[in-house]
Amino acid sequence: LSTCKTIDMELVKRKRIEAIRGQILSKLRLASPPSQGEVPPGPLPEAVLALYNSTRDRVAGESAEPEPEPEADYYAKEVTRVLMVETHNEIYDKFKQSTHSIYMFFNTSELREAVPEPVLLSRAELRLLRLKLKVEQHVELYQKYSNNSWRYLSNRLLAPSDSPEWLSFDVTGVVRQWLSRGGEIEGFRLSAHCSCDSRDNTLQVDINGFTTGRRGDLATIHGMNRPFLLLMATPLERAQHLQSSRHRR
Amino acid sequence: LSTCKTIDMELVKRKRIEAIRGQILSKLRLASPPSQGEVPPGPLPEAVLALYNSTRDRVAGESAEPEPEPEADYYAKEVTRVLMVETHNEIYDKFKQSTHSIYMFFNTSELREAVPEPVLLSRAELRLLRLKLKVEQHVELYQKYSNNSWRYLSNRLLAPSDSPEWLSFDVTGVVRQWLSRGGEIEGFRLSAHCSCDSRDNTLQVDINGFTTGRRGDLATIHGMNRPFLLLMATPLERAQHLQSSRHRR
Amino acid sequence: DIDECSQDPSLCLPHGACKNLQGSYVCVCDEGFTPTQDQHGCEEVEQPHHKKECYLNFDDTVFCDSVLATNVTQQECCCSLGAGWGDHCEIYPCPVYSSAEFHSLCPDGKGYTQDNNIVNYGIPAHRDIDECMLFGSEICKEGKCVNTQPGYECYCKQGFYYDGNLLECVDVDE
Amino acid sequence: ALDTNYCFSSTEKNCCVRQLYIDFRKDLGWKWIHEPKGYHANFCLGPCPYIWSLDTQYSKVLALYNQHNPGASAAPCCVPQALEPLPIVYYVGRKPKVEQLSNMIVRSCKCS
Amino acid sequence: ALDTNYCFSSTEKNCCVRQLYIDFRKDLGWKWIHEPKGYHANFCLGPCPYIWSLDTQYSKVLALYNQHNPGASAAPCCVPQALEPLPIVYYVGRKPKVEQLSNMIVRSCKCS
């Protein structure tokens, strides 16, 4: 029962494909596809693939909701990761090992290398690989604030699980602060949630990168999966482009 | 340099207005405007205006973001409120007054009257009127779980303030649970956030409805502004309509 | 009395003029426009002789595709088999049968339209809507459509029966 | 919802999300994106009827608002509702870069 | 953003949010909604050019994508981006009801 013109589906698809061609270049602020003349032969480095997979996994976990997109968010974000300073570093000696907390420190020079300006950072996530957990545990994340004080950031209720699982905390504001300040090393603390009445405040959850006494090769694998910051930022050259172009809107 | 037809702005406006006519009736599941034959003379009752204003204030505080809207969310939601059981009720005697917590109980029969089926509830907010606060305070909200155990729900960092301010906690899941269970009275606890090291765990914040020793008339005003649950739910008759209509999507 | 017309000159615009009454106002509308129900605005009169598409039903979500005919008046559509009338997927639902709006559009009832060209004793004559001529290929597929007054019949070949929902002749499953 | 679950398994004529896989090499002639090789971009297509609401409303027509013109637009249009980002790997000179492009994958559509 | 701040103070010809106040009595002939008396519904209007991207890309064209076709649609359309709900008070019989209608006020638009 139709007198409608049939839609030329192929034309619509072609127009969509052509629009995507422009969209991707536009999001990357490229006038044309980048030259491939310097690309070395062979597959992508392992570290790059790991980073790509981290990002892809994050996307899969994201709710697919549209958000009003400020202009800066339209453009592509470079993804980098900065691993936690290894636990044998002297910085950890200053913080007494307690049953209720673990500490994670980051080198701000590495952060600055990845994100030169605080304003360029669009998202920072602290990623922790949580190992098996026998009981439910309520944990809290704190930011190192001043000499010996900690500022509460967020909390998470961890369900018991037989398999390891990545935990992700949004720490964008904190990392932006760190990039603005002069400190060399900054850190987080993951603690058991302590209620005012409760006495048992032990951190039961085992986070990869803190367990000691491993065989050499295992320790290396373990170390690769130690806590890290996943950073999404506008590359500096793209940001300068953003500022210099006059915007009507 | 235009060969475009000029847009008939008046026609577009008329079409938008006509579409809104249908949209409002459609959202209210009305086939035509409701009869006004039974409407009493005079202004709207105070309680209704207060409820309308609460809802309007909530809207103003909401971020104007589009959310993928499930079919049930398209239709209008009836707004009601259920006040906390007054503090002289015996239920409060069972919970020792502590420096770090206050308790809020609700009559589930009142909740059920407002929302007969758990599935009809689309949002429940616990609203507390926070009075002046001299220092920053980190508070936590708990739900009464079993005899003497409490389940953590959420937390809030309250900034110092000279003026009273409404606090709002999303407790949709909890109220949905309560509607499903048989209990007569259910409750929340607002506590100071207790860190594992800290000793000073006093709840500094003053919540309207808990301060004693007021003059009679003040106590009444005070009581009207005591904690309440703001409920948004699909009216039962509209829900039956929703279930009965066949949906291809 | 407040003169609403001088207080708000935009009342009744753009398709009419404002006329003040005691305690109220009404709109005097331009040609081709008619006052709204409350007489506080002017809306376009859908000329009965405008020809647009006739839509079969609103049950199917693809009703933009369920076009009975493409060049029919609102009366021809709504006073016969149509559920909606319009074009480019912009649809005026036909008034519900037996409502005041239906009687206003179809004063002679289902199956008839008024013919303003033929006037008997000052009253427009009604004529039967020939559904077969207007909708034949869509309402009597695989059969022979015969116009009746009012309505139509669809005759099917032996071994077939007419399915009133599908509007076509369907093989009898023996 | 007019999402991939509903639309890919139905023959919906009206507004719906439609399948479209883009292979960077085949469709765009690009070899410079090293990962992924392509992605399910999808797109929205199909009419969103505008229903002139008469004073005599009735349920059958009103029920259609939810799908066909929930935003009461003067000219409703089939557009993306839920979108997802796409991470890509490409080289700038000798340096491989991982970048995330926002709002690249259409998961569902709506009349708006 | 194509929001009320920008659009109401400019003469933007392209996609933008346009002012529209709806007075329930005057515009709809309705006296049954007791609160509010009307509301700023607004609406989206204006073209969203489709830019055929040629193999010879150049910055001038690419810069337009962000505004005119950020979603890389085959037929971009000016639609609401940020919406707000509207609470209303009306009577059912003798009983006053407060109800909230979702997505009624258009705050900003986008090409989608």
């Epitope: 030259s35 310097e38 032969p41 062979g42 597959p43 | - | - | 000798r94 | -």
Partner: antibody, heavy 119, light 107 residues
């Protein structure tokens, strides 16, 4: 259209040197890595050497490492292969080819130039 | 170095035949494999890149498949102009290596 033209081949005695050139046209030369591939008479293809678009990075087959040098002059759109200490087993048709992408497929080839190393 | 072994080294076929040539790598090379066609006295011509992608301008009767260590070049219906020698090439790691070639002759 893309064109690659090799030159500089010929007969040379073992231990001597030869310089091959490849003139490129029809594309932005500096945007592409380039390679030399050779084919001994009646035999299969053997990759010899490669160079990145800027000339910054070079790669060699073990059989020629230390004897052959690949270079390019982007201002002249020309690729070179300097062959020193030539051996009889270096006798082959030498092709220059363009590296199409980061995948290192060779999408355009020259017609080849014959190098004969013989005493 | 990564060795590529092509089989068969030669084959005879008729016009219209379906022809399959295989290439096996001495270790996994993911999809970093290309196929070339070479006619006597001519330069090689790229047919397939990245194991399965048809180079622009190459007839669709040519197709490539495989990943890891085992790869296949298929000519769905052999044409007179397809009689030539076919080489596989890995670009997974330097040194880049070619297979020994497969000569397709007229039966």
């Amino acid at each position: 259209q893309v064109q690659l033209v090799e030159s500089g081949g010929g007969v040379v005695q073992p231990g001597r040197s030869l310089r091959l050139s490849c003139a490129a046209s029809g594309f932005t030369f500096s945007d592409y890595a380039m390679v030399w591939v050779r084919q001994a008479p009646g035999k299969g293809l053997e990759w010899v050497s490669a160079i990145s678009g800027s000339g910054f990075t070079t790669y060699y087959a073990d059989s020629v490492k230390g004897r052959f040098t690949i270079s390019r002059d982007n201002s002249k759109n020309t690729l070179y292969l300097q062959m020193n200490s030539l051996r009889a087993e270096d006798t082959a048709v030498y092709y220059c080819a363009r590296v199409s992408s980061g995948h290192w497929d060779f999408d355009y080839w020259g017609q080849g130039t014959l190098v004969t190393v013989s005493s | 170095d990564i060795q590529l072994t092509q089989s068969p080294s030669s084959l005879s076929a008729s016009v219209g035949d379906r022809v399959t040539i295989t290439c096996r790598a001495s270790q996994s090379i993911s999809s970093y494999l290309n196929w070339y066609q070479q006619k006597p006295g001519k330069a090689p011509k790229l047919l397939i890149y990245a194991a399965s992608n048809l180079q622009s301008g190459v007839p669709s009767r040519f197709s490539g498949s495989g990943s890891g260590t085992d790869f296949t070049l298929t000519i769905s219906s052999l044409q007179p102009e397809d009689f030539a020698t076919y080489y596989c090439q890995q670009t997974y790691t330097v040194p880049l290596t070619f297979g020994g070639g497969t000569k397709v002759e007229i039966k």
